[in-house]
Interface confidence: medium
């Protein structure tokens, strides 16, 4: 039997030291932050990388990871000879298992794998494997890069010295040296059969906290065919607490992976906290922005002939994997909230990463259903205006779906934002459906073990006087063409309303596959083909917040953890340095710019040229080496939200007329100083409906689940 713990995300950690075997038993201990001092963090948003530094001071250090490795400036280190691997050629035992930590997918190694050489101070034992990936279609997902080139996936193997410590966790907690290997996965036409056990495992840990045993695999087969060409540098954990204790070995050559196999990574879910609401989202882009090298020197191995046979295109294509086939990451922080009895406000934030700037405008699409009839409307909103729209003449008995897409030059589009559902007059919470692999809910209720984790909990924010249901589902952050053959009428109305009796609220992050096929012409410019809806029966669900939980270990506190939110920006940037960086003059070499706003500042925009840097010890000048990806604040208002309603006094309640959209002028604070999301409840005068409910998760609530049992052999995901 699998024992699940579904944690409010602020109660779980995701850094490399977080997941380890309890030496006195077989349980995995997820340490609680109150006891350990580990703050909640995320890869984007208000808890994103630029904010890690405020609660994990080491994240602001100067020897941080990941980095971009410029081959021409890496010096050959004669001490970096052949790696000695021991045990890597053995098949893994059936006790090796995989876990979705919510921040990554980790493989807990139960066999003895040792590495020595490569300048490591001793013989190090492999503890675990973690993965980092992008969002779709082989987009950049690696943390490290070589000559500016990033890869779709990076696998990291973490090691500790068992002669010095009895466990990996002890080494971390005592701030002692650990080792890490970084292995890049690159897209190839064919499946890599060596990855099959991993891919199969991924399908068993789709949801946060899921665990599964892995079929036997050979760890050596997950490494590049040639191990002779590698880079070495001293850095840090790439997740909080960002301890600067890692001896990194970064392999030059990638491991092949097919698009089909990549999809298993893109299908992983996590839970995120947004303004007290727990939402289920795809776990994507789980990489830390790159950090500056500062006074460090990157070395390369001195293994004879190992550097002579690298693929020419690898060296000649500095950009490598395109950041995306779309012009930016999706608009984020989608919110739908009622302004009064007949109007809704949709708000969002600008994308965190813009691959092909600038954003010209945003397409806001919304559909609604009434009496099985389906309607849709799309309109544009200039990107330099406040990123919110008012939908007036809202019908209380219609179900509304909203999503936003950024539009760049040449009609290039971003990925779609998460899709928000809203309906007033709710009578019960939508929590009984199953989400199948395509993201289309089936009408049949799921068993309790397979309940989609979409209920946000049972506490009600009564102080607002505005009760509505906010229920969370998976994000539809697919490619910009991710329309589907399913229609809102057929899927949403019949499935959700008829099949489930869903009556209201906003469902955050509805799957994009539920969006209607008939998107307006303006909103369907992407040339990519829509993927067919495959109604598989594999549930991507995990128990809801009230799932089984084990007792807290040793009475460790499980309260909300440390979040030292001192930085102005709430949009964690992806591919730029935020907290470990200094200065803000330079662009990333790939031409990526970043829209997320940081603190008030009037620095010039980044320019391609960058100051020369002299490497310590080498005395050679390295032109433009240190990419500084520090967020440069903009005058855009994209980061701002929670403006006053700005209501139209002439709005008329109507259940017959389709809603109209109006742009809303923001009358708030300095546009250069984006505010954090306001937690302030709306006034009673703005309330939408007395019989709606706003389901939230109270951050102060305790989660008494301190341990998670390892999966029993009899029950595989």
């Amino acid at each position: 039997v699998l024992h699940y713990v579904v944690c409010f995300p602020a109660l779980t950690e995701g850094y490399v030291g977080a997941l380890h075997e309890n030496r006195h038993g077989s349980a995995v201990q997820i340490r609680r932050r109150k006891a350990s001092g580990d703050p909640y963090w995320a890869y984007s948003g208000a808890y994103g990388p630029e904010h890690w530094v405020t609660s994990s001071v080491s994240c602001g250090g100067r020897h941080q990871s990941p980095i971009d490795i410029l081959d021409q400036y890496a010096r050959v280190g004669e001490e970096y000879q052949e790696l000695q691997l021991d045990g890597f050629d053995n098949e893994s035992s059936n006790k090796t298992w995989m876990k979705n930590t919510g921040k990554t997918v980790a493989i807990l190694l139960k066999d003895d794998y040792f590495v020595s050489g490569a300048g490591l101070p001793g013989r190090f034992k492999a503890e675990k494997v973690e993965f980092h990936w992008g969002h779709s279609n082989g987009s950049a997902g690696s943390e490290h890069s070589i000559n500016g080139r990033r890869f779709p996936v990076e696998m990291q193997i973490f090691f500790y010295n068992p002669d010095d410590f009895d466990s990996f966790q002890t080494a971390i907690s005592e701030n002692r040296i650990i080792g890490a290997m970084a292995i890049f996965f690159q897209v190839s036409p064919r499946d890599n059969s060596a990855l099959d056990p991993i891919i199969h495992g991924l399908k068993g840990v789709v949801h946060h906290e899921k665990e599964t045993f892995l079929d036997p695999f050979v760890l050596r087969d997950l490494l590049p065919a040639s191990l002779g060409s590698y880079y070495r540098y001293t850095g840090s954990l790439t997740t909080p607490p960002c301890s600067e204790i890692v001896e990194w070995i970064v392999f030059r050559r990638p491991v092949p992976i097919s698009y089909h196999q990549l999809e298993a990574f893109y299908s992983i879910f996590t839970t995120e906290q947004q303004d007290h609401v727990k939402s289920v989202e795809y776990l994507r882009n789980n990489f830390r922005p790159q950090q500056r090298l500062h006074d460090r020197v990157v070395s390369k191995s001195a293994v004879r002939d190992s550097w002579n046979h690298d693929m020419t295109d690898f060296l000649e294509n500095p950009l490598g994997t395109e950041a995306s086939k779309v012009c930016s990451s999706p608009p984020i922080h989608m919110k739908v909230q009622p302004l009064n009895q007949t109007a809704l406000q949709v708000s969002w934030s600008q994308p965190e990463t813009i691959y092909h700037p600038p954003i010209m405008n945003y397409m806001i699409s919304y559909s609604w259903t009434k009496n099985e009839d389906e309607k849709e409307k799309t309109f544009t909103k200039d990107s330099d205006k406040d990123l919110k729209a008012t939908i007036s003449h809202v019908s209380p008995d219609s179900l509304y779906l909203f999503r936003v897409q950024a539009v760049c030059r040449n009609d290039m589009r971003s990925d779609f934002s998460q899709t928000m559902l809203f309906q007033a007059n709710t009578t019960r919470i939508f929590q009984g459906t199953r989400i199948v692999k395509t993201g289309v809910p089936t009408a049949s209720p799921a068993s309790s073990a397979d309940m989609a984790p979409i209920s946000s909990g049972s506490s009600t924010w009564t102080s607002s006087g505005i009760p509505f249901s906010f229920v969370s589902m998976a994000t539809g952050m697919g490619p910009s063409s991710s329309g589907s053959q399913a229609t809102v009428a057929s899927v949403v109305t019949s499935t959700l309303l008829a099949g489930l009796g869903f009556g209201g609220g906003g469902i955050s992050s509805f799957p994009s596959t539920v969006w209607p096929t008939r998107l307006p012409t303006a909103a369907s410019a992407s040339k990519q083909a829509a993927r067919p809806v495959l109604a598989t029966t594999e549930a991507l669900a995990s128990p809801g917040p009230d799932g089984d939980s084990s007792p807290t270990k040793d009475g460790e506190g499980t309260e909300e953890g440390e979040k030292d939110e001192k930085s102005e920006s709430e949009d964690g940037e992806r591919e730029h340095e935020e907290d470990g960086e200094k200065d803000s003059e330079k662009k990333e070499k790939s031409g990526v710019t970043h829209a997320a706003e940081e603190r008030n500042q009037t620095e010039p925009s980044p320019t391609p040229s960058s100051p020369n840097r002299t490497a310590e010890g080498g005395h050679q000048t390295i032109p433009g080496h240190e990419q500084d990806h520090t967020a440069v604040p903009t005058d855009q208002t994209g980061g701002r939200r929670d403006a006053g309603p700005g209501l139209d006094p002439d709005m008329v309640t109507s259940t017959q007329v389709p809603p109209t959209a109006t742009e809303e002028q923001y009358a708030g604070s300095d546009p250069k100083r984006p505010e954090m999301p306001s937690k302030k409840p709306m006034s009673r005068g703005d309330r939408f409906s007395e019989d709606s409910r706003f389901i939230t998760v109270n951050p102060a609530e305790k989660n008494t689940s301190g341990m998670i049992s390892r999966p029993a052999p009899g029950r595989m995901e």
């Epitope: 703050p39 530094v53 979040k563 001192k566 008030n600 505010e675 954090m676 951050p699």
Partner: antibody, heavy 113, light 111 residues
Framework: QSLEESGGRLVTPGTPLTLTCTVS????????MSWVRQAPGKGLEWIGT?????YTYYASWAKGRFTVSKTSTTVDLKITSPTTEDTATYFC??????????WGPGTLVTISS | SFVLTQPASVQVNLGQTVSLTCTAD??????ASWYQQKPGQAPVLLIY???SRPSGVPDRFSGSSSGNTATLTISGAQAGDEADYYC?????????????FGGGTQLTVTG
């Protein structure tokens, strides 16, 4: 967005005193707040910080002498047993780790017998 | 404990350039911020993250960092720049977080 300290007054040594920083325009659940003091003619001295979740950090010299707490819109600094050395102007500040340009005007505390 | 050292006072002629320094062991691993404080007022942030300048701060103020020394440079000093200047940084990690101010430098603008 604004901060304002209050509660500063003249008290005798040993009499507990609580200062309050009232914030508006941003959420304390998303921001860390710090208390800094400045004795007359002296430099700035960090006392402690409370983060978005209510976790507290103190200067080594301040532990046990000061307590930082908060409500939804206020951050309090309790001087548990003031001495004359605690006479100072007390400031609250937001986002001090990387540098804060959100400071209150300060409130003067005088400890005298 | 972590100590930031600043010169107690510095003089500069009107219109000249002056550099205020702040040193500490391992400052190279920390970010420095700089504050200006005039009598009876709260500190005003001039520089954060070693080199970044908030909006509203004149570009006459610039920050730099080299090794274990952070420097605030004021070019074209004006009478209104006469004030106390404090450098600051954070030290430690996690629960042992400590924030430290330097002792301050009193800048006098002459002429």
């Amino acid at each position: 967005q604004s901060l304002e300290e209050s509660g500063g007054r003249l008290v005798t040594p040993g009499t507990p005193l609580t200062l309050t920083c009232t914030v508006s325009g941003f959420s304390l659940s998303s921001n860390a707040m710090s208390w800094v003091r400045q004795a007359p003619g002296k430099g700035l001295e960090w006392i402690g910080t409370i983060d978005g979740y209510g976790y507290t950090y103190y200067a080594s010299w301040a532990k046990g002498r000061f307590t930082v707490s908060k409500t939804s819109t206020t951050v309090d600094l309790k001087i548990t047993s003031p001495t004359t050395e605690d006479t100072a102007t007390y400031f609250c500040a937001r986002e001090i780790y990387l540098g804060s340009n959100f400071w209150g005007p300060g409130t003067l505390v005088t400890i005298s017998s | 404990s972590f100590v930031l050292t600043q010169p107690a006072s510095v003089q500069v002629n009107l219109g000249q350039t002056v550099s205020l320094t702040c040193t500490a062991d391992t400052l190279s691993r920390r970010y420095a911020s700089w504050y200006q404080q005039k009598p009876g007022q709260a500190p005003v942030l001039l520089i954060y993250r070693d080199t970044s300048r908030p909006s509203g701060v004149p570009d006459r103020f610039s920050g730099s960092s080299s090794g274990n020394t952070a420097t605030l440079t004021i070019s074209g000093a004006q009478a209104g720049d006469e004030a106390d200047y404090y450098c600051a940084t954070a030290d430690g990690s996690g629960s042992s977080y400590q924030f430290v101010f330097g002792g301050g430098t009193q800048l006098t603008v002459t002429g």
